[in-house]
């Protein structure tokens, strides 16, 4: 299979000069590293920080949304170390961790007013922040938390470079005093869980302090990543020595603690994935071990399987897994070794980003009970990483997409099988971002975000779709790259779309490209299943071309056909006339065959033999309609573009177009009647229709009132008959 390549769809959308200047001011000091991440929320933000300067930009346009320069109490300005998107009381903001000479400060920053509205001091050097909840009190929405945490109003988990894990009360019930980062409140740390939390909290707050629970006292080992998994109600904590811990927020106890396979390499990121309908209540956690920019060269992905006793749907609609039974590593992928053939010796591999994308089937397609806990029917994890190779100026950047449901389908292997590479794996798809690097060099890529809503597989080339259609290499999606100077948009297309694009570009020289085009369509799963076991060499060029044309019609890639037609008409090449005649005949034959198939499918609608249509038949009828509609567009192109044609030829062509247009309309009407419940027709006319699409009494009243009005206005001169 050919490598998939991302295409850049925009130039560099630079940050405003004021943003670049503000971030550049501190780059001269050694400690000030430019950090940048897309915010995980739905507000389309990207946060960049360098030293004490924070810049918040629109992740699509790069325009500046908010900015702030933090002040400290020491000679050295503070350094922004951690940023997390956080919303509370209809306000959107950020939780920010600042490092100072002595300790750290946790700030609540309001994006609407570009100000710090709350701040509290922290011990040690903060390495990560994670919001647990943005409200408080003993309401139904806090039931999943430990009783002690329910007395707090807004909770953030904060971790430090010495392994301390704190759950800090954000005191969102007291926003009376606006305090900036210099005026940060004191903090009172509770070890263990006292009984009288409400009284202690009241007293502590009165003294101008925030309360916090210490889950883990300083151990000396830095926490390298932190993530709250709402669906399992666990705080996942990754350490710099390769250990991963899971803390349950209901019991406030550690449920799991293990060193991952790559040993003493920091756990750099974690992301959650849920498969579709696992009967054993299993869900998954990816843990990424990475040396990043430090010594050594390790980047490995570890998939942990978490099995739970119970999976329930809360009143809020949220899914909650309870009662962890076991947790074990089920899959490992090393992105530094020879997992895919690289030219040259790698020097450093680092993760740029990781995210999970889930899609739930729309309500109309569901068969489950309303209160049943639904699982996503699409669940993928996206990893982006950069490989620096000795002797090469530019790094190589890759995007990998892991489809957990396809991994299940592949019978859950524990790693790539021998001889299997990432670019020919049935559950992992790989895109090269070489074009992005070329266009953005020398600007470094800070983060990459795939737009969830853009992720799609396109139109199935046949029903049922071929096996390849379900592989992650058929996904199409858009993404954005965050650079130190702006944003760049890109699109990743799957094998099917890429193959169709290739054919579209092949133009008049199609004849020479037929064998290659056919093979590409075959590999991409674009051809009818009947071609799968047929040797391409045993097919004539015409048969191969017909298969390609079918793929274009089935997938609604009409630009491919109409493009050929227009070019063959305008550029009179040796084979143009032959090609045009062939495609016209093929199109008309396809109309005839599709109409016959449509009529066959519609027989039960009219002969009284059935009282309802099964979804499969409805889908087949819809597919026929789509084909007829596409074929009609092709004939319309012939009719509108036709030149130097005999009168008889023109009449023949317009007749074909009119007939196909009428057939199309007929199919549309049949579909409308069946959707409205007016078809299929029962033998017994007295059978009551479940639901009329028009309300007779309403229509009758309306027309009666109109008649009366006209009669009044015409003073008896109007004759309703």
């Amino acid at each position: 299979m050919r490598d998939l390549r991302a295409q850049v769809t925009s130039g560099l959308l630079p940050f405003p000069e004021v943003t670049l200047q503000a971030l550049g001011e501190d780059e001269i000091t050694l400690e000030s590293v430019l950090r940048g991440k897309f915010a995980a929320g739905k507000n389309g933000l990207a946060c960049l920080a360098c030293g004490p300067q924070l810049e918040v930009v629109n992740s699509i346009t790069g325009e500046r949304l908010s900015a702030y320069r933090f002040s400290g109490v020491n000679e050295q300005p503070p350094v922004v170390l951690a940023v997390k998107e956080f919303s509370w009381q209809k306000r959107t903001g950020l939780l920010i961790g600042l490092e100072e000479t002595e300790g750290s400060v946790l700030c609540l920053y309001d994006l609407g007013i570009s100000k710090v509205v709350k701040a509290v001091v922290l011990p040690g050097r903060v390495t990560a922040i994670e919001p647990i909840i943005n409200h408080g009190g003993a309401s139904a929405s806090t039931q999943h938390l430990h009783p002690s945490l329910r007395w707090l109003f807004g909770v953030a988990a904060v971790v430090t470079d010495v392994g301390q894990i704190l759950l800090v009360d954000l005191c969102l019930d007291d926003l009376s005093c606006n305090q900036n980062e210099v005026e940060a409140s004191d903090l009172e740390v509770l070890t263990g869980i006292p009984a009288e939390v409400p009284h202690i909290r009241e007293s502590v707050m009165r003294q101008g302090r925030h309360l916090c629970f210490q889950l883990v006292s300083p151990t000396g080992t830095a926490v390298s990543t932190l993530s709250y998994i709402s669906r399992t109600n666990q705080l996942a904590v990754g350490f710099s020595d390769g250990y991963l811990a899971l803390w349950n927020m209901k019991s406030m106890k550690r449920e799991y603690y293990i060193q991952l396979e790559s040993g003493q390499v920091p756990v750099y990121a974690v992301t959650f994935q849920e498969p579709e309908n696992d009967p054993r209540n299993c869900c998954y956690l990816w843990a990424v071990q990475s040396t990043q920019d430090s010594e050594g060269d390790v980047l490995s992905l570890h998939l942990l399987q978490l099995a739970f006793g119970n999976r329930k749907c809360l009143a809020s609609g949220q899914i909650l897994y309870e009662g962890l039974e076991y947790c074990e590593e089920r899959y490992t992928l090393d992105l530094t070794g020879g997992m895919f053939p690289l030219r040259g010796q790698t020097s450093n591999t680092k993760l740029l980003g990781c995210q999970s994308i889930e899609k739930f089937r729309s309500h109309g397609d569901r068969e489950e009970g309303v209160n049943e806990a639904l699982s996503p029917d699409t669940s993928v994890s996206v990893f982006t990483w950069q490989v620096n190779i000795y002797g090469q100026g530019k790094p190589s950047v890759y995007l990998g997409l892991f489809d957990i449901n396809r991994w299940y389908h592949a019978q859950m292997p524990d790693s790539l099988r021998s001889g299997e590479y990432l670019h020919n794996c049935s559950y992992f798809a790989l895109w090269s971002l070489e074009s992005v690097v070329s266009r953005t060099s020398p600007h470094g890529i800070l983060d990459i975000l795939v737009h969830e809503r853009s992720l799609n597989r396109g139109v199935p080339p046949s029903y049922p779709p071929p096996e390849q259609f379900f592989n992650p290499s058929t996904y199409n999606f858009d993404a954005t790259c965050l650079l130190n100077s702006g944003v760049v948009h890109l699109t990743c297309t799957g094998f099917q779309k890429e193959t169709l694009t290739f054919l579209k570009k092949s133009g008049p020289s199609l004849n020479e490209l037929i064998p290659d085009g056919y093979n590409r369509c075959l590999v991409a799963g674009l051809l009818s299943p009947r071609f799968v076991d047929v040797q391409p060499s045993s097919l004539s060029q015409e048969e191969q071309l017909e298969a390609i044309l079918s793929a274009a019609i089935q997938t609604s890639s009409l630009g491919l056909l109409t493009g050929y037609i227009r070019r063959w008409i305008t550029e009179e090449q040796p084979n143009s006339a032959t090609n045009l005649r062939f495609v016209l005949e093929w199109t008309w034959n396809k109309v005839v065959l599709t109409k016959e198939e449509f009529d066959r499918l519609c027989v039960p609608l009219f002969d009284g033999s059935c009282h309802f249509m099964d979804p499969q038949t409805i889908q087949s009828i819809q597919q026929c309609y789509l084909l007829l509609s596409n074929l009609n567009i092709v004939l319309s192109c012939f009719a509108s573009e036709a030149r130097e044609i005999t009168e008889r030829g023109l009449i023949d062509l317009s007749n074909k177009f009119v007939v196909s247009h009428l057939i199309c309309q007929y199919a549309q009407v049949v579909l409308w009647f069946s959707h409205s419940g007016l078809l299929p027709e029962g033998i017994d006319d007295s059978v009551q229709l479940s639901r009329l699409c028009y309300n007779y009494p309403v229509i009758q009243n309306y027309y009666t009132s109109r008649r009366q009005k006209f009669e009044r206005l015409s003073r008896g001169k109007w004759n309703p008959d």
Epitope: E102, Q179, V182, E183, S185, D186, T191, P194, Q207
Partner: nanobody, 124 residues
Framework: QVQLVESGGGLVHTGDSLRLSCAAS????????ISWIRQPPGRGLEWVAK????????FYADFVKGRFTISKDSTKNTLYLQMDNLDAEDTAMYYC?????????????????RGQGTQVTVSS
């Protein structure tokens, strides 16, 4: 940059009084809560007293309640600790400090900023 400078310490006898001062610069005392902490010989830092930003609330550790009074003069940007009925147990280095992290026993785990301290020695 915040600077805190303590003064007023000295050698006194049991039952005597002392008034400590802390002059703040680079910081508006009317905008922040600030504390007095101390470190007795061979022991960790202990929280002593705190006054809130608006000056309305003052809070004390149990061992000084009724004997020590914290106050501030926002016009002079100065913090005070009036210490009466001193005891040998009050012998310590006293600091005014900002941004405290402490445990429920009043032990100070870290401070964001503090002065160089002023020594108070109470002899019996």
């Amino acid at each position: 940059q915040v600077q805190l400078v303590e003064s007023g310490g000295g050698l006194v006898h049991t039952g005597d009084s002392l008034r400590l001062s802390c002059a703040a610069s680079g910081l508006d005392l009317s905008r922040v809560g600030i504390s007095w902490i101390r470190q007795p010989p061979g022991r960790g830092l202990e929280w002593v007293a705190k006054i809130l930003a608006d000056g309305t609330g003052a809070f004390y550790a149990d061992f000084v309640k009724g004997r020590f009074t914290i106050s501030k003069d926002s016009t002079k940007n100065t913090l005070y600790l009036q210490m009466d009925n001193l005891d040998a147990e009050d012998t310590a280095m006293y600091y005014c400090a900002l941004g405290l992290v402490q445990d429920s026993q009043g032990l100070v785990l870290s401070s964001r900023a503090r002065g160089q301290g002023t020594q108070v020695t109470v002899s019996s």
